[in-house]
């Protein structure tokens, strides 16, 4: 058993049929010695008396808010949560496996630049009685500070018969140099509590590996005289690290119709303009990627050919 | 210690081409190592990230773009003495600060070159003959060093009398290649910045 926060405790249980469970001793936070009784949740049934209460925790029915009273007055509370371990593996029931970039990916993180600011998100099908708390650091043995905000519900989607909820959090490394060469990864830890179930999820990464620039901005087309060719130009996204001559991007320019299976014109360039062939009912799209360290491509910025 | 903005004329920067070749060569070699040594811990997640130049050179700080010198987190107190007669820019405008930057890059390359050559000598003794360093990568390091053209003491190639542990050598190769790729990215950024300034 360990303390998650004040008056909230996590009991780690090996979860299998007829498991013996864990013996837990609760102590009432009071100078009083006599006349103390214990109850669980909203029940008025007295579970025991005295300053300490010993319980055998085996299942979720044994978890919950234990309260010690004296003469009708509440003295203190202890909330017990369960953390299940099945076949030596901690449960991951609360969050959905996003399976990208690999299986067992519950947390996904992205950074728009090298400033040390990043966003992580996760998915769940649970809509109520759910809380998250996020901590982060650079390295684990001698951790350096990363400050994370509160996790918020950022999107809701319908997936077949189910509703899916996306939560996200923004974090900022306390003293980040955009030009630094990372040798210690960022560690992100998410505590998830659903009703009386506790789970924790972690992710470890270098900012350089989670870079995904914003799409290029200000796409403009200039038809070339006596030709089907069009000069398309764009600018670096505002959110990208500066100076741009140091933090350079490379671009992919594509002309394609509405369907992904349609024929296309595609060219890669390090410049902020390119010449492509425009077709009726097609769109010109441009996306960006770090020129020197190949992490993710940005989403496409698009303009219609016409 | 940073790069001033007033630097070379366009087309006066032979190092940019070499640095692009360097990044390409080390990325290819790293990819090859990850494929060939698939049963060894050779991915970014599996290895310890070590920097053999730590406390010996300070390329990131010495080559910091002017725009980032206002960022407290980018300024490191480490001081290293550098040789300052580089000719990469082929221009008399080479400032003292830039010379510090370029000589730091040169020292990095020299250190990695020695490490890679020592390691290759060991890998050539491996009866499995599983992996060797790409001669192209070693050649590209040499070309960039020549373009930088700094005089400095020759670092003797380390020779080891004991029987090499090939497993450890291959893991060390992965560690070295990951670190060198990151440094090659920095070098490419620096050269691009200097070329544009």
């Amino acid at each position: 058993i360990w303390e998650l926060k004040k008056d909230v405790y996590v009991v780690e249980l090996d979860w299998y049929p007829d498991a013996p469970g864990e013996m837990v001793v609760l102590t009432c936070d009071t100078p009083e010695e006599d006349g103390i009784t214990w109850t669980l949740d909203q029940s008025s049934e007295v579970l025991g008396s005295g300053k300490t209460l010993t319980i055998q925790v085996k299942e979720f029915g044994d978890a919950g808010q234990y309260t010690c009273h004296k003469g009708g007055e509440v003295l203190s509370h202890s909330l017990l949560l369960l953390h299940k371990k099945e076949d030596g593996i901690w449960s991951t029931d609360i969050l959905k496996d996003q399976k990208e970039p690999k299986n067992k990916t519950f947390l996904r993180c992205e950074a728009k630049n090298y400033s040390g600011r990043f966003t992580c998100w996760w998915l769940t099908t649970i809509s109520t009685d759910l809380t998250f708390s996020v901590k982060s650091s650079r390295g684990s043995s001698d951790p350096q500070g990363v400050t994370c905000g509160a996790a918020t519900l950022s999107a809701e989607r319908v997936r077949g018969d189910n509703k899916e909820y996306e939560y996200s959090v923004e974090c900022q490394e306390d003293s980040a140099c955009p030009a630094a060469e990372e040798s210690l990864p960022i560690e992100v830890m998410v505590d998830a509590v659903h009703k009386l179930k506790y789970e924790n999820y972690t992710s470890s990464f270098f900012i350089r590996d989670i870079i995904k620039p914003d799409p290029p901005k200000n796409l403009q087309l200039k038809p070339l005289k006596n030709s089907r060719q069009v000069e398309v130009s764009w600018e670096y996204p505002d959110t990208w690290s500066t100076p741009h001559s140091y933090f350079s991007l490379t671009f992919c320019v594509q002309v394609q119709g509405k369907s992904k299976r349609e024929k296309k014109d595609r060219v890669f360039t390090d410049k902020t303009s390119a010449t492509v062939i425009c077709r009726k009912n097609a769109s010109i799209s441009v996306r960006a990627q770090d020129r020197y360290y190949s992490s993710s491509w940005s989403e496409w910025a698009s303009v219609p050919c016409s | 210690r940073n790069l001033p903005v007033a630097t070379p004329d366009p087309g006066m920067f032979p190092c940019l081409h070499h640095s692009q070749n360097l990044l390409r060569a080390v990325s290819n070699m790293l990819q090859k190592a990850r494929q060939t040594l698939e049963f060894y811990p050779c991915t970014s997640e599996e290895i310890d990230h070590e920097d053999i130049t730590k406390d010996k050179t300070s390329t990131v700080e010495a080559c910091l773009p002017l725009e980032l010198t206002k960022n407290e987190s980018c300024l490191n107190s480490r001081e290293t003495s550098f040789i300052t007669n580089g000719s990469c820019l082929a221009s008399r405008k080479t400032s003292f600060m830039m010379a510090l930057c370029l000589s730091s890059i040169y020292e990095d390359l020299k250190m990695y070159q020695v490490e890679f050559k020592t390691m290759n000598a060991k890998l050539l003794m491996d009866p499995k003959r599983q992996i060797f360093l790409d001669q192209n990568m070693l050649a590209v390091i040499d070309e960039l060093m020549q373009a930088l053209n700094f005089n400095s003491e020759t670092v003797p190639q380390k020779s080891s009398l004991e029987e090499p542990d090939f497993y450890k050598t291959k893991i060390k190769l992965c560690i070295l290649l990951h670190a060198f790729r990151i440094r090659a990215v920095t070098i490419d950024r620096v050269m691009s910045y200097l070329n544009a300034s």
């Epitope: 490379t250 349609e262 024929k263 595609r266 060219v267 890669f268 010449t275 062939i277 077709r279 | -």
Partner: antibody, heavy 118, light 107 residues
Framework: QVQLVQSGAEVKKPGSSVKVSCKAS????????LHWSRQAPGQGLEWMGW????????EYAPKFQGRVTITADESTSTAYMELSSLRSEDTAVYYC???????????WGQGTLVTVSS | DIVMTQSPLSLPVTPGEPASISCRSS??????LHWYQQKPGQAPRQLIA???QSISGVPSRFSGSGSGTDFTLTISSLQPEDFATYYC?????????FGQGTKVEIK
């Protein structure tokens, strides 16, 4: 499976024209660009131009501009390449090719040998 | 027009050994470079797209690298069926242009 079948070998006199056909099968004809390239005996490949059968848009290499005409007939899924004012140096194997990506070629025809000789 | 220069023009290789072919462009072309293989009396066949992207159905011993002006096609271990002529082609701008070809021959 996409296939391109080209017309047979031709022998032409200098100054005349040649029209090579290329019939496509497999897939929708207008879903692809069609390119024409050539290869002189023992020489490398030389790109001549492309057509978009959907709208008859074409682009020609400056070297052949004014001498080459590429057309496409959607009803028969056939593309044509006509080269006029033939000279002996136009002796080559002419290839049609089909691609979803405008700028590179993934499926080639078997080639048509055009010999220009007096 | 962008001029593509391949080297060497002839490459004698022992079967089972690796082979590398270089292709250089007169202007910087990013990764807009493609590789083809051609056997005598046959049409070319695509091997690599955009400098390093492998094509389905092409054996994994063929790999490409490079960007800007310098590109390499590598065959990790030459098989008897790999003896052929190899061409690079730039797609950065029209007209599309090919290298002169590199003939890989049995040593």
């Amino acid at each position: 499976q996409v296939q391109l079948v080209q017309s047979g070998a031709e022998v032409k006199k200098p100054g005349s024209s040649v029209k090579v056909s290329c019939k496509a099968s497999g897939g929708t004809f207008s879903d692809y660009y069609l390119h024409w390239s050539r290869q002189a005996p023992g020489q490398g490949l030389e790109w001549m131009g492309w057509i978009d059968p959907e709208n008859q848009d074409t682009e020609y290499a400056p070297k052949f501009q004014g001498r080459v005409t590429i057309t496409a007939d959607e009803s028969t899924s056939t593309a044509y390449m006509e080269l006029s004012s033939l000279r002996s140096e136009d002796t080559a194997v002419y290839y049609c090719a089909r691609t979803k990506e405008l700028r590179y070629i993934d499926v080639w025809g078997q080639g048509t040998l055009v010999t220009v000789s007096s | 027009d962008i001029v593509m220069t391949q080297s060497p023009l002839s490459l004698p290789v022992t079967p089972g050994e690796p082979a590398s072919i270089s292709c250089r462009s007169s202007d910087s072309i990013s990764i807009n470079l493609h590789w083809y293989q051609q056997k005598p009396g046959q049409a070319p066949r695509q091997l690599i797209a955009f400098a390093s992207q492998s094509i389905s159905g092409v054996p994994s011993r063929f790999s490409g690298s490079g960007s800007g002006t310098d590109f390499t096609l590598t065959i990790s271990s030459l098989q008897p069926e790999d003896f052929a002529t190899y061409y690079c082609q730039q797609s950065n701008s029209f007209p599309l242009t090919f290298g002169q070809g590199t003939k890989v021959e049995i040593k």
